[in-house]
């Protein structure tokens, strides 16, 4: 029977004739930076080439006994998970291994840096097809390691890393915290986060998605035909490296941004029990378990978007938080969130020639998050239109006035300290969906984009009684680009996108002691691209 992990990443209604890239990843080379490996294991022999690269520290302890099978254990297993004949994800992928971890599984930042440089030089000397680099290791936060990952990613290499097994915020570790790297957490057969002794998978906003990482059968370095189960975020990352190899083999021209968006899009959504994560991390941690796409066709026409959370601003009065999209992505909307509800909104602003999303803390607030909605929108021309606070009691409003530009997101930002309470509701005039409205004391920012065939519509869901959470989702075929709250009398903590659903959170009714705070309305902006749809039809 198929191992649970391979079954899990195989989408429902999967048909062999429908998704078969040439030999399951054969056009892709996967570099593995790990321990030494047993390359003559029949699961991987002929598929893994051991490079002459080795940069490892001495093993600790005077009585350490270097046993080949133990030295090779971690790397051999991971090579098997990526491309093993029987238990591998991408059975056609070829691999190259670099030894950066010693027999105790320890390495150094410098060793890993030199390994990454070795790959970069190899790529320059002998350019091949798409490259995936698997980094199944985690150490303390390292600015220099993250920078090296960024350089390699910008050279067109896909880097996949383990989130770490410390039951902690992945942003505290490297290379997991590098934004350019695809960071993978681990789940088990029940789609629950993996517990490893007293610890377990890392979590948080630096994790891109989860993948099977408990009781994973793979090649064992004990013998040429041995298999063993291992667990951890390394195994999870190996699954995603395999999936990436499959996707890149089917579509070799995919950019890192496109690949990441597809990994997110085709993941199983909302299957992880978030109660395992610390309460403050639940909203930040993606509820996504990696899966292979059901088909190589039909993905190209979709408008792909993902949600990017900033780091926490910190509690100081003027603190801000910034969320950024990847270089190839467009920022289509910006929202903010504060657990205390004390915030001064958010705005989209230019920084280094690119739009970023900045959220503002308020006096007495415990800090804010900025939430960017980052999308793949080829040939897009986006700009931000701002309306300063209005004098009129009707409130502030702004719309996209340029011909062919459509509204993709609304943000509001205010200077007054606490704009969430005791303000009269503002009603959107009917028949004017292409505009943003807000409090008269607030500046309103509209994200307006022109792209071939782009069309958007506004969808609202209002609840008259106070609710902790109000949601509105885009229907099939449409992608959520913007998520905000219509100004009302209820105290809104913020708004954010979860997959294709806009979530507006309000202060817990039980803590306010009042049940007459009024309506909460979630506003979703849903878009689609007719141009992308037509382009994909022409290709087939």
């Amino acid at each position: 029977s198929i191992p649970w992990n391979l079954e899990r990443i195989t989408p429902p209604r999967y048909r062999a004739d429908e998704y078969q890239p040439p030999d399951g990843g054969s056009l892709v080379e996967v570099y593995l930076l790990d321990t030494s490996i047993q390359s003559d294991h029949r699961e991987i022999e002929g598929r893994v080439m051991v490079t002459d690269f080795e940069n490892v520290p001495e093993e600790d302890g005077t009585r350490f006994h270097r046993q080949a099978s133990k030295c090779d254990s971690h790397g051999t297993h991971l090579a098997g998970v990526v491309s093993g004949r029987d238990a591998g994800v991408a059975k056609g992928a070829s691999m190259r291994s670099l030894r950066v971890l010693n027999c105790q599984g320890k390495g150094t930042v410098s060793g890993t840096l030199i390994g990454l440089e070795f790959i970069r030089k190899s790529q320059l000397v002998q350019p091949v097809g798409p490259l995936v680099v698997l980094l199944p290791l985690a150490g303390g936060y390292s600015r220099v390691l993250n920078a090296a990952c960024q350089r390699l990613a910008r050279a067109g290499v896909v880097l996949v890393t383990a989130a770490g097994n410390f039951r902690d915020d992945a942003c505290l570790y490297s290379p997991a915290s590098a934004p350019e790297v695809i960071t993978v957490g681990a789940t088990n057969a029940q789609d629950q986060p993996v517990t490893l002794g007293t610890l377990g998978t890392n979590f948080g906003r630096c994790v891109d998605l989860f993948a099977p990482g408990e009781d994973i059968i793979g090649a064992s370095s004990d013998c040429s035909t041995c298999f063993v189960s291992q667990s951890g975020t390394s195994q999870a990352a190996a699954h995603v490296a395999g999936i990436a190899a499959m996707m890149l083999s089917a579509e070799p021209e995919l950019t890192l941004a496109e690949l990441r968006q597809r990994l997110i899009h085709f993941s199983a959504k909302d299957v992880i029990n978030e109660a395992w994560f610390p309460e403050d991390q639940r909203v930040l941690t993606p509820n996504l378990v990696a899966a292979l796409p059901p088909s190589t066709h039909g993905a190209g026409w979709q408008l792909f978007c993902r949600t990017v959370w900033s780091a926490h601003s910190g509690p100081t009065r003027m603190a801000t938080a910034v969320a950024r999209c990847a270089p190839d992505e467009e920022l289509l909307s910006c929202s903010s969130f504060s657990r205390s509800g004390k915030r001064r909104g958010e705005r989209m602003e230019a920084q280094g020639g690119k739009l970023v999303c900045r959220a503002h803390n308020a006096f007495g607030g415990e800090g804010v998050y900025a939430i960017a909605r980052c999308c793949l929108l080829p040939q897009a021309n986006c700009s931000v239109h701002t309306a300063p606070p209005a004098e009129a009691s009707m409130g502030t409003r702004v719309h996209c006035h340029q011909q062919g530009h459509v509204l993709t997101g609304c943000s509001s930002h205010w200077e007054v300290e606490d704009l969430g309470t005791h303000k009269p509701p503002v009603l959107r005039p009917r028949g004017q969906p292409n505009q943003c409205v807000g409090h008269r004391e607030a500046s309103i920012h509209a994200s307006c984009c022109h792209a071939p065939g782009l069309e958007c519509k506004v969808k609202e869901h209002g609840i008259p009684a106070p609710q902790e959470q109000v949601t509105v989702a885009c229907e099939e075929g449409w992608t959520l680009t913007g998520c905000s709250a219509l100004p009302g009398t209820s105290h809104v903590l913020g708004a954010y996108a979860v997959d294709n659903t806009c979530v507006v959170r309000s202060r817990d009714v039980s803590t306010t002691g009042s049940t007459s705070e009024g309506a909460v309305t979630a506003v979703a902006i849903c878009c689609r691209s007719r141009h992308l749809a037509q382009a994909s039809q022409e290709l087939q």
């Epitope: 029949r42 002929g46 598929r47 004949r85 238990a87 059968i217 004990d222 040429s224 041995c226």
Partner: antibody
Framework: QVQLVQSGAEVKKPGESLKISCKGS????????ISWVRQMPGKGLEWMGL????????RYSPNFQGQVTISADKSISTAYLQWSSLKASDTAMYYC????????????WGQGTLVTVSS | DIVMTQSPDSLAVSLGERATINCRSS????????????LAWYQQKPGQPPKLLIY???TRESGVPDRFSGSGSGTDFTLTISSLQAEDVAVYYC?????????FGQGTKVEIK
């Protein structure tokens, strides 16, 4: 049902070439290894080598390396064992058997092909 | 290569009696990472291909009568037929499948006394 069906008995002269076959059915042929095992008259079992039809990976016993060639055609779910120049000492019963990666024992065997090499 | 040695070479047992075959490997076929012995037992009747009886040293293949049992670990293994039946007359082979080349014992012939 799962089975391996081997080609019929062969009588050959020394120096001739030969290719015998083993066709799998009732299972995913590319997901299992096929081993070839020799049994000389009145003797025990000797493992010759294997192939993984999924990617044609082969592994030979040192005793048979260079003496025989193992191949497969996954499009027709068939594995082959061939000799370019037979010797009288190649007279034996040849079995194919399948095994799985993490279940590396041979659970299904072909009925055998008797090869007789005689001048 | 791992050398597999069976004893005895042949064995004559009365119907209904116990038959015991031993197999020794020149090196351990027990692996600590998964705690499995990479050893199988096969039965070959005259004019037939071998048939899998036992794998992982002690796991009976489905459809094999429960009078067949395997035991042992590391380098020493035993196949036991608890109550010999007429249809059990055959040659029995042990096999290690952990290391290449895969190797078989020389075989033990079981007959009825």
């Amino acid at each position: 049902q799962v089975q391996l069906v081997q080609s019929g008995a062969e009588v050959k002269k020394p120096g001739e070439s030969l290719k015998i076959s083993c066709k799998g059915s009732g299972y995913s042929f590319t997901d299992y290894y096929i081993s070839w095992v020799r049994q000389m008259p009145g003797k025990g079992l000797e493992w010759m080598g294997l192939i993984y039809p999924g990617d044609s990976y082969t592994r030979y016993s040192p005793n048979f390396q260079g003496q025989v060639t193992i191949s497969a055609d996954k499009s027709i779910s068939t594995a082959y064992l061939q000799w370019s120049s037979l010797k009288a000492s190649d007279t034996a019963m040849y079995y194919c058997a399948r095994d799985h990666g993490y279940r590396p024992y041979s659970d299904i065997w072909g009925q055998g092909t008797l090869v007789t090499v005689s001048s | 290569d791992i050398v597999m040695t069976q004893s005895p070479d042949s064995l004559a047992v009365s119907l209904g009696e116990r038959a015991t075959i031993n197999c020794r490997s020149s090196q351990s076929v027990l692996y600590s990472s998964n705690n499995k012995n990479y050893l199988a037992w096969y039965q070959q009747k005259p004019g037939q291909p071998p048939k899998l009886l036992i794998y992982w040293a002690s796991t009976r293949e489905s459809g094999v009568p429960d009078r067949f049992s395997g035991s042992g670990s590391g380098t020493d293994f035993t196949l036991t037929i608890s109550s010999l039946q007429a249809e059990d007359v055959a040659v029995y082979y042990c096999q290690q499948y952990s290391s290449f080349p895969i190797t078989f014992g020389q075989g033990t012939k079981v007959e009825i006394k």
